[in-house]
Interface confidence: medium
């Protein structure tokens, strides 16, 4: 009679699963781009902003050729978990200025959580280890000021945008190697 309602589809084709992950990543990329533009519109950025607690970009044009699926999925999941933590922090600690970006920030968080669940499912289907590599979790302290939280938001959305952009490229490339 088939699997019970609500249970994940058992797929014998990892390419289909990868396709689904790519679609979700693309969708999240579009949302992030839109929210980053909204941020720039509402709170113009004075130059590039960085945040020490954000993960360093995992992929670059030079590394695309040597990508391996296990490494990409594991690193992507770790990085996206870090971004999820940062988005949650922004929503709670950002103060009144960032409250004006709701419900968009909330929707972004929900889609990020959905993509993370999809990546976890893909990794289990491909029998890849779920354990994330040991990385020190830098505690996210309070922003120094409201202006500081706006700068942090620019950095978080900018970093997430770049990460997702490379993730789409990397996943598409890996799909051709499956």
């Amino acid at each position: 009679p088939g699997p019970p309602a609500g249970s994940p589809r058992v797929s014998s084709d990892p390419r289909a699963d990868l396709d689904s992950a790519v679609l979700l990543t693309r969708s999240l990329l579009a949302d992030t781009r839109q929210l980053a533009a909204q941020m720039r519109d509402k709170f113009p950025a004075d130059g590039d902003h960085s945040l020490d607690s954000l993960p360093t970009l995992a992929m670059s044009a030079g590394t695309l050729g040597s990508l391996q699926l296990p490494g990409v999925l594991t690193r992507l999941r770790v990085d996206l978990m870090s971004y999820l933590r940062h988005v949650q922090w922004l929503r709670r600690a950002g103060g009144p200025s960032l409250k004006t970006l709701e419900p968009e920030l909330g929707a972004l968080q929900a889609r990020l959580e959905r993509l993370l669940r999809r990546l976890q499912l893909l990794m289990s289907r491909l029998a890849l280890p779920q354990a994330a590599p040991d990385q020190p979790v830098i505690p996210l302290g309070p922003p120094a000021s409201a202006w500081g939280s706006i700068r942090a938001a620019h950095a978080i959305l900018g970093g997430l945008h770049l990460t997702l952009d490379w993730a789409v490229r990397g996943l598409l490339l890996l799909k051709t190697r499956l």
Epitope: K42, F43, R92, G95, P96, K99, T100, P142, A146, W147
Partner: antibody, heavy 117, light 110 residues
């Protein structure tokens, strides 16, 4: 040293207006969201309004919406609260408070507003 | 009627540990940070705990905050006479788009 000094309080008749000021010093005023919080005699704290660091976003408590206006002049390091159509229940000590995010880390000493005929 | 619920009073003897509770909902405590303020008689409130459980510099480690779900609590150990004050919890409320306070708890050191 961070300092917030409120002024402009006094006795006013119901229906009249009053403008409170909060002079800030010892920090970069334009980097911080600012709030007004009030406390009626013998009662608890009640949040009134907040304005974002650059002045474009404002939120108000339902009890003052449409009557009170929060504003700021970053060039003068000053926060304002314009109070119109004052009622007896607006009688309170009004505090301005600085927020780096979700908490008030510095408060002024307060200014008393008495609405009475 | 305050959005956050606190007991109106609490008491203890010097050296004792007292806990003050603060109950809210998913739109305030459940999704935002809780802060605690101390107001000594005749003075302006002062930040005591922020980000649920962090202490500003200068606040003794006898004061601690915790949060679980839609409730928070403030614990004061090694109670001293100078701790006699009103204590307020507060959080941003997403539904009201504003800050909400508890009604305050008057702490008496017996």
């Amino acid at each position: 040293e961070v300092q917030l000094v409120e002024s402009g309080g006094g006795v006013v008749q119901p229906g009249r207006s009053l403008r409170l000021s909060c002079a800030a010093s010892g920090f970069t005023f334009s980097h911080y969201d600012m709030h007004w919080v009030r406390q009626a005699p013998g009662k608890g704290l009640e949040w009134v309004a907040v304005i974002s660091y650059e002045g474009s976003n404002k939120f108000y408590a339902d009890s003052v919406k449409g009557r009170f206006t929060i504003s700021r002049d970053n060039s003068k390091n000053t926060l304002y609260l314009q109070m119109n159509s004052l009622r007896a229940e607006d009688t309170a000590v009004y505090y301005c408070a600085r927020t780096p995010g979700s908490h008030f880390d510095y408060w002024g000493q307060g200014t008393l507003v008495t609405v009475s005929s | 009627q305050s959005v956050l619920t606190q007991p109106p009073s609490a008491s203890g003897t010097p050296g004792q540990r007292v806990t003050i509770s603060c109950s809210g909902s998913s739109s305030n405590i459940g999704s935002n940070y809780v802060n605690w303020y101390q107001q000594l008689p005749g003075t302006a409130p002062k930040l005591l705990i922020y980000y649920d459980d962090l202490r500003p510099s200068g606040v003794p480690d006898r004061f601690s905050g915790s949060k679980s779900g839609t409730s928070a609590s403030l614990a004061i150990s090694g109670l001293r006479s100078e701790d006699e004050a009103d204590y307020y919890c507060a959080a941003w409320d997403d539904s009201l788009s504003g800050v909400v306070f508890g009604g305050g708890t008057k702490l008496t050191v017996l």
